[in-house]
């Protein structure tokens, strides 16, 4: 049902859904801190623009009695319950910042007449693609998929002279929310990734993964997985690995690889790590002081959601336009705004663009080094290290099919 919005006469409210089920197990207090820090900045920016208005946030908590798994499994109903709560209280703001679980976002989008924008820190799954009033501030699965296809096809770099068309995907069901949807997208038979590959098999058991590492009859040399180095070690241990195996470890929200004193463990030598270009580990604001890198990215997305709303509010107010209109609801896309950690670019569908970085372990220095970067906005790869000190023969990535190329 239509809910009146607290969004006019110089007073603009943000509805923040504080859900017990969340993409990352983050204390809600930290998210509140991020939102409040964002509000201070937005108020200052509006004042600087000569706009004398009030901006506040209302935090909407669920009772947590029914939906208390803490992860995203029971988030679908929690999101709808919160919306019902907002509806009953007639307390809808100009914008909804909140659901981070793909399940809840998808269902809320489906079950409501959204005449207001929805900003999500998460909602990684393909089912949340191409939603007209949804903005996602953490890299969704579609962006990962496009990188992988681009990289698989690349064959004109000094260190990659073969196009690839095959892959194994390791997915055992214990993944974090981001990894779950990233791998889900790769697994889906109708996805762009599956469409572009000639062979793709999902490995669901540890033993399947372990067997492939030395199986002479394997159908691909490339294995994609998602998680951190410790996750890989638990699975792989110190097992021998065929020399033409390439493991692609997707670990987007982790900038530990860029820290000065980090040495790559030996088991990472056959691994290419895909992560995001680092911000700074110097984030020292009240909300980020005690956060792990992943959780900092999550809290940062909440803060940037507030800054994005402030950016759009400022534009509409300066142009004398109404905020409670479909035009405003559909405007949170195809733009760049000044985020907390630098410029943030949203694509035509409201999804954040970023620079992905592919790292390798240097056999000389045992350090992680940047092999290439990929700009999701233009779907383009930029080689960085033209002479990588790889573990693979001739310092080239092997062919993806055993028995061909440098072995």
């Amino acid at each position: 049902s239509q809910v009146s919005q607290n969004c006019h006469n110089g007073s603009y409210e943000i509805s923040v859904l504080m859900m017990g089920n969340s993409a990352f197990a983050e204390p809600l207090k930290n998210l509140e801190d991020a939102v409040n820090e964002g509000l201070e900045i937005v108020r200052g920016r509006l004042q600087n623009a000569g706009l004398n208005v009030t901006v506040n946030a209302t935090f909407m908590y669920s009772d947590g009695l029914i939906h208390n798994s803490g992860d995203c499994r029971s988030s679908t109903c929690e999101g709808l319950d919160l919306l019902r709560k907002i509806s009953n209280a007639q307390r809808m703001g100009c914008v909804l910042i909140g659901p981070s679980c793909t399940y809840s976002t998808f269902q809320m989008y489906l079950d409501t007449e959204l005449s207001y924008p929805m900003i999500s820190a998460g909602s990684f799954g393909l089912s949340c693609d191409y939603k007209e009033t949804l903005t996602r501030l953490m890299s969704p699965a579609r962006k990962l998929m496009y990188f992988l296809v681009n990289f698989w096809k690349t064959n004109d770099l000094p260190f990659k002279t073969y196009s690839w068309s095959t892959s194994y995907v390791y997915k055992n069901g214990t993944e974090t929310e981001d990894c779950f949807w990233y791998l889900n997208a790769l697994e889906a038979s109708v996805s762009y990734f599956s469409h572009e590959l000639g062979f793709k098999v999902v490995l669901r058991q540890d033993k399947e993964f372990q067997d492939i590492l030395m199986d002479h009859n394997r159908k691909s040399n490339v294995i994609i997985m998602c998680g951190g180095p410790e996750f890989l070690y638990k699975l792989k241990g110190d097992r021998a690995v065929a020399e033409d195996i390439v493991i692609i470890l997707v670990d987007l929200f982790n900038d530990q690889y860029f820290e000065d004193n980090v040495t790559a463990p030996d088991y990472m030598k056959n691994v290419l790590v895909l992560t995001l270009s680092p911000g700074n580990s110097l984030l020292n604001s009240s909300f980020s002081r005690n956060l792990s890198p992943t959780k900092r990215d999550f809290a940062l997305a909440y803060l940037n959601g507030i800054l994005l709303f402030g950016h759009m509010l400022k534009i509409f107010l300066e142009n004398g336009e109404n905020i409670t209109t479909p035009k405003f609801a559909h405007a949170f896309r195809n733009l760049t705004f000044e985020g907390y950690d630098g410029p943030v670019t949203l694509d035509d569908w409201g999804d954040v663009d970023s620079t992905m970085v592919l790292l390798y372990t240097s056999v000389d220095t045992k350090k992680y080094k940047v092999l290439l970067t990929y700009d999701t906005h233009v779907n383009k790869t930029y080689p960085v290290d033209m002479s990588p000190t790889f573990t693979w023969k001739n310092s080239k990535l092997p062919n993806d099919i055993t028995g061909r190329g440098p072995q």
Partner: nanobody, 119 residues
Framework: QVQLVESGGGLVQPGGSLRLSCTSS????????MDWYRQAPGKQREIVAT???????TYSDAVKGRFTISRDNAKDTVYLQMNSLKPEDTAVYYC?????????????WGQGTQVTVSS
């Protein structure tokens, strides 16, 4: 109207150091990032360093490892510490703050401070 005032420029020998300051009449450094630019005689104005709200910093290749940008919110001041100065660092240095415009430069400029590196 936001005012930015640079100071700290001067004449210095190659290899020497200077610290530039940019002070604001408002809280602009607490709500937007800030850039230092420089313009050498007969050349285009070029970006030198940026500091964002989070404290994240970026530098042009020409100054990386030699210059450090920092901020003191309590004093509404941003600094540019310049070490190992070279003759090619000679330029007028400007601070640029506020909301980025369509051309990526920010709203407000200071009047500039001259840095001359010469023996």
């Amino acid at each position: 109207q936001v005012q930015l005032v640079e100071s700290g420029g001067g004449l210095v020998q190659p290899g020497g150091s200077l610290r530039l300051s940019c002070t604001s009449s408002s809280n602009i450094f607490r709500i937007y990032g800030m850039d230092w630019y420089r313009q050498a005689p007969g050349k285009q104005r070029e970006i030198v360093a940026t500091i964002y709200l989070s404290g994240r910093t970026t530098y042009s290749d020409a100054v990386k490892g030699r210059f450090t940008i920092s901020r003191d919110n309590a004093k509404d001041t941003v600094y540019l510490q310049m070490n190992s100065l070279k003759p090619e660092d000679t330029a007028v240095y400007y601070c640029n703050a506020g909301e980025p415009t369509a051309s990526s430069v920010r709203q407000y400029w200071g009047q500039g401070t001259q840095v001359t590196v010469s023996s």
